[in-house]
């Protein structure tokens, strides 16, 4: 007899886009409309919740911009929280200082992406230092992952 | 009887590098020589043409440089076109303003990468705002994707 | 008879983090402690050694910073060496010039990531132009790959 048909497992993947009603950290994300993907991973209060242990490529981009450059330090972090551990683990981080000419209109992006071994129930979040300087266009600011 | 040997499907993948004879938008790419990859995806007039619906990680880097900085706004977009839709969809975008000291020789890169659900016949392109400021070295400016 | 159980192959993956005792090029990496991954790939004297030919997504981020900006040109390269070839092949590269305000404390990252067809025994390395300006925090400076 031929082998049973292969059960095609749903790929665990997420691509969430900027949500302009973020008021505090961590950033909140659009998980429903536009070019969003969410499959085999849950979204909860700004976080992507892993439900299967394994290797994941995790990425995020944040678009910072302002009208009158004051060169406030900018930071962009992807971090992980798990109830088993007392402290957040910063997985990836980007920092910028002295990045524009004082007083000028400016714009700059930070991109992060890498592979991590994640455990079921890990929660992944994105944090920025200056929320007021983030632009939330879906093509400019995003957060995603996929299971290898 | 034992099952037939597994047919190893060719991985759908592309990595195209900068082509200095780009004269207009979208950017054109080297699809033959050097560290180029093109398998299970077609290249046509600057675009990567998807021939199988599914999840893809899409990425691009563009290297901008100039002899005398005048801080022209720079943009770098990956966008999608499909004959079923009247308008291009910007998938990912990076913008830079006020990024160098007036009059100085300068150099800067923009990197984009994320996961998208693409449909057979989608055409993917890269657009930049200032073609004359792009350097097309194969290690510096590129465009690629692979099917998850 | 039913087919033999599928042998689950270990995913070939690496994520190495910054190691502050790098004294010369190529950069050296932390391959044991922290959020490091190393499976099906070897680490040797700063390099990731491929032991199975195939398609790999390769990435690196380097975090540059300084106390008093003098706009030294910065470069960040991922390159490949193989005993069959006389010369290193630069796979990806980022350059920065005129990126901060003279005399100011500054910080900036460079991110690279793309797909390559690698051959067994290829050695991959990361090079930077100004070692003294690199910060080696594990979340900020890293080097990784995975087999597609």
């Amino acid at each position: 007899p031929s082998p049973p048909p292969e059960k095609k497992e749903l790929r665990k993947v997420a691509h969430l886009t900027g949500k302009s009603n973020s008021r505090s950290m961590p950033l909140e994300w659009e998980d429903t409309y536009g070019i969003v993907l969410l499959s085999g991973v849950k979204y909860k209060k700004g976080g992507l919740v892993i439900n299967e242990t394994g290797l994941y490529f995790v990425y995020s981009k944040v678009y910072f911009r302002g009208q009158s450059c004051n060169n406030l330090p900018l930071s962009h972090k992807v971090y992980m929280r798990n109830s088993k551990y007392p402290q957040d683990l910063v997985m990836m981080e980007g920092k910028m200082m002295s990045y524009c000419t004082t007083g000028q209109m400016w714009a700059r992006s930070s991109y992060l992406g890498a592979v991590f071994n994640l455990t079921s129930a890990d929660h992944l979040y994105v944090n920025v230092s200056e929320l007021s300087l983030v632009n939330f266009e879906e093509s400019q600011t995003f957060f995603g992952l996929y299971k290898l | 009887p034992s099952p037939p040997p597994e047919k190893k499907e060719l991985r759908k993948v592309a990595h195209l590098t900068g082509k200095s004879n780009s004269r207009s938008m979208p950017l054109e790419w080297e699809d033959t020589y050097g560290i180029v990859l093109l398998s299970g995806v077609k290249y046509k007039k600057g675009g990567l043409v998807i021939n199988e619906t599914g999840l893809y990680f899409v990425y691009s880097k563009v290297y901008f440089r100039g002899q005398s900085c005048n801080n022209l706004p720079l943009s770098h977009k990956v966008y999608m076109r499909n004959s079923k839709y009247p308008q291009d969809l910007v998938m990912m975008e990076g913008k830079m303003m006020s990024y160098c000291t007036t009059g100085q020789m300068w150099a800067r890169s923009s990197y984009l990468g994320a996961v998208f659900n693409l449909t057979s016949a989608d055409h993917l392109y890269v657009n930049v705002s200032e073609l004359s400021l792009v350097n097309f070295e194969e290690s510096q400016t590129f465009f690629g994707l692979y099917k998850l | 008879p039913s087919p033999p159980p599928e042998k689950k192959e270990l995913r070939k993956v690496a994520h190495l983090t910054g190691k502050s005792n790098s004294r010369s090029m190529p950069l050296e990496w932390e391959d044991t402690y922290g959020i490091v991954l190393l499976s099906g790939v070897k680490y040797k004297k700063g390099g990731l050694v491929i032991n199975e030919t195939g398609l790999y997504f390769v990435y690196s981020k380097v975090y540059f910073r300084g106390q008093s900006c003098n706009n030294l040109p910065l470069s960040h390269k991922v390159y490949m060496r193989n005993s069959k070839y006389p010369q290193d092949l630069v796979m990806m590269e980022g350059k920065m010039m005129s990126y901060c305000t003279t005399g100011q404390m500054w910080a900036r990252s460079s991110y690279l990531g793309a797909v390559f067809n690698l051959t067994s025994a290829d050695h991959l390395y990361v090079n930077v132009s100004e070692l003294s300006l690199v910060n080696f925090e594990e979340s900020q400076t890293f080097f990784g790959l995975y087999k597609l």
Epitope: G66, Q67, S68, C69, L72, T102, M105, S132, L133 | - | G103
Partner: antibody, heavy 119, light 111 residues
């Protein structure tokens, strides 16, 4: 409440320098770039320049280079502007104004400092 | 630099009527979907006060009788219905690039 308090009026002789101050209160001083504006009868309002209250470097209108020098003291939340080699043309009211980087315009202004140059 | 030309230099409007002030820029002050034009009100002995930012957005605490419109190079400030307390000088100002410039001002009198 948010306030930008400028130093008092100055009556000075031609050829000397004057340094005027602008103290911010009611907000995080280093979060906002500080701009300076000149108002004279002859030329309405003129933008002089801007200083980063965070890192202390300034950007000047070409017309005021060599005339104005902007500095900042983060510890006292105060911005300063020194005007050099004064002439009667420099007689005017000088304003400081903060500019939120995430906004479009100068939202709070100091009350102004009158500088009169006369022999 | 971008030159802003305001007109009229002065106008007198009856209480309750509409006052319209124009500002023309020597080049576009638009970028990326926004118009970088602002309007200020200044009364004697006081600093300028922000009324309208980004061409048409009312600053917090400013009465709704003030409105702004326009894009590119042509912008308008409207006040309707004019009230006694609106007697002042009005300035347009762009923040598209450095150096910022201001219009010459329009003095509004209430009849």
């Amino acid at each position: 409440q948010i306030q930008l308090l400028q130093s008092g009026a100055e009556l000075v002789r031609p050829g000397v320098s004057v340094k005027i101050s602008c103290k911010g209160s009611g907000y995080t001083f280093t979060d906002y770039a500080m701009h300076w504006v000149k108002q004279s009868h002859a030329k309405s309002l003129e933008w002089i320049g801007v200083i980063s209250t965070y890192q202390g470097d300034a950007n000047y209108n070409q017309k005021f280079k060599g005339k104005a020098t902007m500095t900042v003291d983060k510890s006292s939340s105060t911005a300063y502007m020194e005007l050099a080699r004064l002439t009667s043309e420099d007689s005017a009211i000088y304003y400081c104004a903060r500019f939120p980087d995430w906004d479009y315009a100068m939202d709070y202004w100091g009350q102004g400092t009158s500088v009169t140059v006369s022999s | 630099e971008i030159v802003l030309t305001q007109s009229p230099a002065s106008l007198a409007v009856s209480l309750g009527q509409r006052a319209t002030i124009s500002c023309k820029a020597s080049q576009s002050v638009d970028y990326d979907g926004d118009s970088y034009m602002n309007w200020y009100q200044q009364k004697p002995g006081q600093p300028p006060k922000l009324l309208i930012y980004a061409a048409s957005n009312l600053e917090s605490g400013i009465p709704a009788r003030f409105s702004g419109s326009g894009s590119g190079t042509d912008f308008t400030l409207n006040i309707h219905p004019v009230e006694e307390e609106d007697a002042a000088t009005y300035y347009c100002q762009h923040s598209r690039e450095l150096p910022y410039t201001f219009g010459g001002g329009t003095k509004l009198e209430i009849k």
